[in-house]
C-alpha cells in the first residue's frame, strides 16, 4: 500500500478542514480494508486516536475528536480522507493516515501537518 497526502494544510480557526489521504494498492479493495487516523500534538504529548474505517466508518467515542470528525473517503476510489470540524488552535499538529489492505503489505504511514491560523494568508486567498 502506498499513501499520498497533502503533507501540509493551513486552515482558519473555527472552520472545517478536509484531511486528504489517498492510496494505491495491488490488492483489490474489499472488506479487509482498514483506515486508522491518529493525531500527534505539537507539544509532543501522547498520540491520539481520531478515526477508524472498516466496512463502516467509526468516530471516537471519547476525547477531543468526539463529534468533530466524519468520514469523507471512498474506498472504491482509493480515498481515505476525513473531515475535521470546528477547528481549534490546539488541533495544530500532525495527522497520520494508516491504510491496511490485506494481502498487500502495509506501506509508510501518510502524514499531514495541520496549522490552524487566525486568518488565511493573502497568498492563499488568491488560490481560493
Amino acid at each position: 500500500v502506498e499513501i499520498y497526502t497533502s503533507r501540509v494544510l493551513e486552515a482558519v480557526n473555527g472552520t472545517d478542514a478536509r484531511l486528504k489521504c489517498t492510496f494505491s494498492s495491488f490488492a483489490p479493495v474489499g472488506d479487509a480494508l482498514t483506515v486508522t487516523w491518529n493525531f500527534r500534538p505539537l507539544d509532543g504529548g501522547p498520540e491520539q486516536f481520531v478515526f477508524y474505517y472498516h466496512i463502516d466508518p467509526f468516530q471516537p467515542m471519547s476525547g477531543r475528536f468526539k463529534d468533530r470528525v466524519s468520514w469523507d473517503g471512498n474506498p472504491e476510489r482509493y480515498d481515505a480522507s476525513i473531515l475535521l470540524w470546528k477547528l481549534q488552535f490546539d488541533d495544530n499538529g500532525t495527522y497520520t493516515c494508516q491504510v491496511k489492505n490485506p494481502p498487500d503489505v502495509d506501506g509508510v504511514i501518510g502524514e499531514i501537518r495541520l496549522s490552524v491560523v487566525h486568518t488565511v494568508r493573502f497568498s492563499e486567498i488568491h488560490f481560493l
Epitope: 482498514t34 501522547p46 491520539q48 486516536f49 463502516d56 471519547s62
Partner: antibody
Framework: QVQLVQSGAEVKKPGASVKVSCKAS????????MHWVRQAPGQGLEWMGE????????DYNEKFQGRVTMTVDKSTSTAYMELSSLRSEDTAVYYC?????????WGQGTLVTVSS | QIQLTQSPSFLSASVGDRVTITCRAS?????MYWYQQKPGKAPKPLIY???NLASGVPSRFSGSGSGTEYTLTISSLQPEDFATYYC?????????FGQGTKLEIK
C-alpha cells in the same frame, strides 16, 4: 513522561462516601479526557465514566449515575472521583486512566474497602 | 449495554506456543481493544482499534476481527506473556470489558 499518581487506600463504612484523587503530569492536562475504571478483587474491569478536563463535562456509566461525581482542578492537574452511598460490593481498586489511542496510561490504583 | 464474552477463560500453554483468544460481542461492534494485566498492576494496552499495536508492544501480538467476533493472537509465547488478557469495546456507550482470559504456564 506521562504519570498518573493516585491517592492512598481508604477504608469506609457502608453508606459513606469516598473521594479518590489522581494527579497528572508529563502532558497537557486538558488535552486528554480522564476516565475511571474499577476492579473488584479477583474480578474484571468496569468503566465508571469520563470527564473532559477542558470544560468539566462528564459522561457516566448509567450503573453509577446519581452516586458518582467526577471533577477536575485544572490549576493542579488533578482529577477526582467521588462515590457516595457506598456498599460492600463497591470494594475494589479504582483506577484513573487517560484515553489516547486506547486507555493507554493508568494510575497505580486506589484500593477502597467498604466494611462495617 | 454490549456484553463481551472471552474464550477460553483459562488457558495453559508453553513458551513458544501460538495462542489465540477470542472475544464475542452480544451485538456488532466497530472495533476492539485488548489489554494485558499482571497481578497487582494496572492493565496495559496491547491493541487499539482491532489490529493496531499500542506503543512499545512486540510484533508477536496481533489482533483481527469484525462484527461480533475478534481475536488476539500471540505468535510465539514468551515468559513475560503469562498474564490475564481483556478485550474492550468502545463503539457503543458504555464501554465494556470481557471477563478476562488467564494465560498460565503449562
Amino acid at each position: 513522561q506521562v504519570q498518573l499518581v493516585q491517592s492512598g487506600a481508604e477504608v469506609k463504612k457502608p453508606g459513606a462516601s469516598v473521594k479518590v484523587s489522581c494527579k497528572a503530569s508529563g502532558y497537557t492536562f486538558t488535552n486528554y479526557w480522564m476516565h475511571w475504571v474499577r476492579q473488584a478483587p479477583g474480578q474484571g474491569l468496569e468503566w465508571m465514566g469520563e470527564i473532559n478536563p477542558t470544560n468539566g463535562g462528564t459522561d457516566y456509566n448509567e450503573k453509577f449515575q446519581g452516586r458518582v461525581t467526577m471533577t477536575v482542578d485544572k490549576s493542579t492537574s488533578t482529577a477526582y472521583m467521588e462515590l457516595s452511598s457506598l456498599r460492600s460490593e463497591d470494594t475494589a481498586v479504582y483506577y484513573c486512566t487517560i484515553y489516547t489511542t486506547a486507555l493507554d496510561y493508568w494510575g497505580q490504583g486506589t484500593l477502597v474497602t467498604v466494611s462495617s | 449495554q454490549i456484553q463481551l464474552t472471552q474464550s477460553p477463560s483459562f488457558l495453559s500453554a508453553s513458551v513458544g506456543d501460538r495462542v489465540t483468544i477470542t472475544c464475542r460481542a452480544s451485538s456488532s461492534v466497530g472495533y476492539m481493544y485488548w489489554y494485558q494485566q499482571k497481578p497487582g498492576k494496572a492493565p496495559k494496552p496491547l491493541i487499539y482499534v482491532t489490529s493496531n499495536l499500542a506503543s512499545g508492544v512486540p510484533s508477536r501480538f496481533s489482533g483481527s476481527g469484525s462484527g461480533t467476533e475478534y481475536t488476539l493472537t500471540i505468535s510465539s509465547l514468551q515468559p513475560e506473556d503469562f498474564a490475564t488478557y481483556y478485550c474492550q469495546q468502545w463503539s457503543s456507550n458504555p464501554p465494556t470489558f470481557g471477563q478476562g482470559t488467564k494465560l498460565e504456564i503449562k
